[in-house]
């Protein structure tokens, strides 16, 4: 059956049991996700805005899929294996009375049974599983996986040791302070800096030590994962964001409608197809797209390119290049090059690299 | 590539009997529910019936409940429905559609057949 | 039960407009909600799932938005291949239908 091909999931709840306090529910579902990550690489986050990978719904009767539920007893819950859309979805029948302890339907236990499912667990022949298909009230403070249950996650996800440090081929979150950590885009918004990472970006507000990472879904539900390239205008309060042969305009951090827009109408060629990196520099008013070994001038106030371009990245950013992941302007005076794990600040006015550092040098590593 | 090639529509008396075959093939059959949509002419779509991976649970639109019948051949990558007491309201195009997940319905369908016409009359 | 309710029913417009079809839910469905075109004589296509998931193969120029009972299907600029039916549907329920037609 299906599983997730990331170790790295988000869960939300979308709505409350009355049964309950609402702090009562998160907890109860915050130690249900803790029972599996505790035998398993998987981590579990909890998000309140955005599309989430696993959806935890009370609801009563028809519900919105093809399975209603059937009122007091019977069908407690249930949920969807992984995948996308429904996948992962667990429902919870809200003509039962959730409780936190043995009286009517213990959350806690009913959520670690349905979080099995919605991890790719079938129901279990052994009894003592928490994946045997029948409710059963065991006491929730000494309670503990079956061996059966164990076995069936490990083999679908492994043990906790394993994959900690992996490359991130699943749009699972990148570790922060991994060496080797790179970005597919950085800008400043105003006084904050914008790290885009596959389906997530970090946010560090100038000057101060913390960061907070967030999915791109949960800021611009209509933004697609993997930006590219990005880039602000201040002085307007836009953000420009590139994917493939499309951008996105943002402003006053709010998507504008219209958009996407094909990166054609700056005026590239017809053989450009995706952007690698942009920054806009508020002296010349101008942005500069970097694509390959190239890259393009673009005058900001007349909306169109400058003559002359593409130039070789190497020719005229002397030790940058011959290709970049992202750039950001800062301080007035520097363009910060991200290429892979390093990072270069390279001073425009002088024309030279004044420091190289780490790409996660920003983040107190 | 998936295909879904739906057969045995055709014209029928009121109070007649009909079973329409659907045949799947390039996805593994075994694994997903499976469903029955209907559109009568010039009308809109209308959910018939599903089943699902194993052919163990089925359900069925109200207007059908009791006189049509959803059934599976994994071994065959077949999929039928029985259909009896047909009315003339039962008049459509049928497709077969196939749902995106196995153990509970979607209620996605991602890949439809081209329909088998099923006609009711006097 | 739940019910759809898809508005407009008929729609005119012409190669290059933006234009927007709604679905309302009678109660919230979270963002379980797919949009379908359906071109004369043929099946129905998946365009949309997940509300404002786009299915592989589909053209950018479409979006959808939405969750709980409000949702809406947006064509940016229409080509002249977009002119059809547009279903949403839920589970079971399939909204009654749009008709986009030329101007």
């Known amino acids: 059956g299906p599983v997730w091909r990331k170790h790295y999931i988000t869960y939300r709840i979308n709505n409350y049991t009355p049964d309950m306090n609402r702090e009562d529910v998160d907890y109860a579902i915050r130690k249900a996700f803790q029972v599996w990550s505790n035998v398993t690489p998987l981590k579990f986050s909890k998000i309140n805005t955005g599309m989430a990978d696993i959806l935890v719904v009370f609801a009563r009767g028809a519900h919105g899929d093809f399975h209603a539920f059937d009122g007091k007893g019977g069908i407690l819950a249930h949920a969807f294996g992984p995948g996308s859309g429904i996948g992962g979805d667990a429902h919870f029948d809200e003509d039962e009375f959730w409780t936190t302890h043995s009286g009517g339907t213990n959350l806690f236990l009913t959520a670690v049974h349905e979080i099995g499912h919605s991890l790719g667990l079938g129901h279990s022949s052994d009894p003592k599983a928490v994946m045997f298909p029948t409710y059963k009230y065991v006491d929730i403070n000494t309670f503990r996986l079956s061996a059966d249950d164990i076995r069936g996650i490990q083999s679908l996800y492994g043990d906790p040791k394993e994959n900690q440090r992996l490359p991130n081929p699943d749009n699972s979150e990148p570790a922060l302070c991994d060496p080797n950590l790179s970005f597919d885009a950085v800008t400043t918004v105003g006084n904050k800096i914008f790290f885009f990472k596959d389906r997530f970006f970090w946010l560090k507000v100038s000057e101060r030590p913390k960061t907070s990472v967030n999915l791109i879904s949960s800021l611009w539900p209509t933004l697609p994962s993997g930006i590219e390239a990005a880039y602000e205008i201040e002085a307007r309060n836009q953000v420009f964001l590139f994917k493939d042969d499309k951008y996105w305009l943002i402003s006053n951090l709010r998507p504008e409608p219209n958009y996407p827009k094909s990166i054609h109408s700056f005026g590239f060629p017809n053989f450009v197809k995706k952007i690698d990196a942009a920054v806009f520099n508020p002296r010349f008013y101008r942005t500069y797209f970097f694509v390959d070994n190239q890259y393009w001038r673009y005058d900001e106030r007349r909306q169109m390119m400058d003559p002359g371009y593409p130039k070789l990245i190497t020719k005229n950013f002397q030790g940058i290049g011959p290709k970049i992941d992202a750039v950001f302007y800062s301080k007035n005076k520097y363009y910060y090059f991200f290429q892979g794990s390093n990072q270069f600040e390279y001073d425009f006015l002088l024309q030279r690299i004044t420091k190289t550092l780490k790409s996660n040098s920003w983040f107190g590593c | 590539e998936v295909q879904l090639l739906e057969s045995g529509g055709g014209l029928v008396q009121p109070g007649g009997s009909l079973r329409l075959s659907c045949a799947a093939s390039?996805?593994?059959?075994?694994?997903?529910?499976m469903h029955w949509v209907r559109q009568a002419p010039g009308k809109g779509l209308e959910w018939v019936s599903g089943?699902?991976?194993?052919?163990?649970?089925?359900i069925y639109a109200d207007s059908v409940k009791g006189r049509f019948t959803i059934s599976r051949d994994n071994s065959k990558n077949t999929l039928y429905l029985q259909m009896n007491s047909l009315r003339a309201e039962d008049t459509a195009v049928y497709y077969c559609?196939?749902?995106?997940?196995?153990?509970?319905?979607?209620?996605?369908?991602?890949?439809w057949g081209r329909g088998t016409l099923v006609t009711v009359s006097s | 039960d739940i019910q759809m309710t898809q508005s407009p029913s008929s729609l005119s417009a012409s190669v290059g407009d933006r234009v927007t079809i709604t679905c309302r839910a009678n109660?919230?469905?979270?963002?379980?909600l797919n949009w379908y075109q359906q071109k004369p004589g043929k099946a129905p296509e998946l365009l949309i799932y997940a509300a404002s998931s786009l299915q592989s193969g589909v053209p950018s120029r479409f979006s959808g938005s939405g969750s709980g009972t409000d949702f809406t299907l947006t064509i940016s600029s229409l080509q002249p291949e977009d002119f059809a039916t547009y279903y949403c549907q839920q589970a079971g329920i399939f909204g009654q239908g749009t008709k986009l037609e030329i101007k």
């Open positions: 109660q919230s469905i979270y963002t379980y």
């Open positions: 089943i699902v991976s194993s052919g163990g649970t089925t």
């Open positions: 559609a196939k749902d995106i997940r196995g153990a509970y319905s979607s209620g996605l369908f991602d890949f």
């Open positions: 390039g996805f593994t059959f075994s694994w997903y529910w």
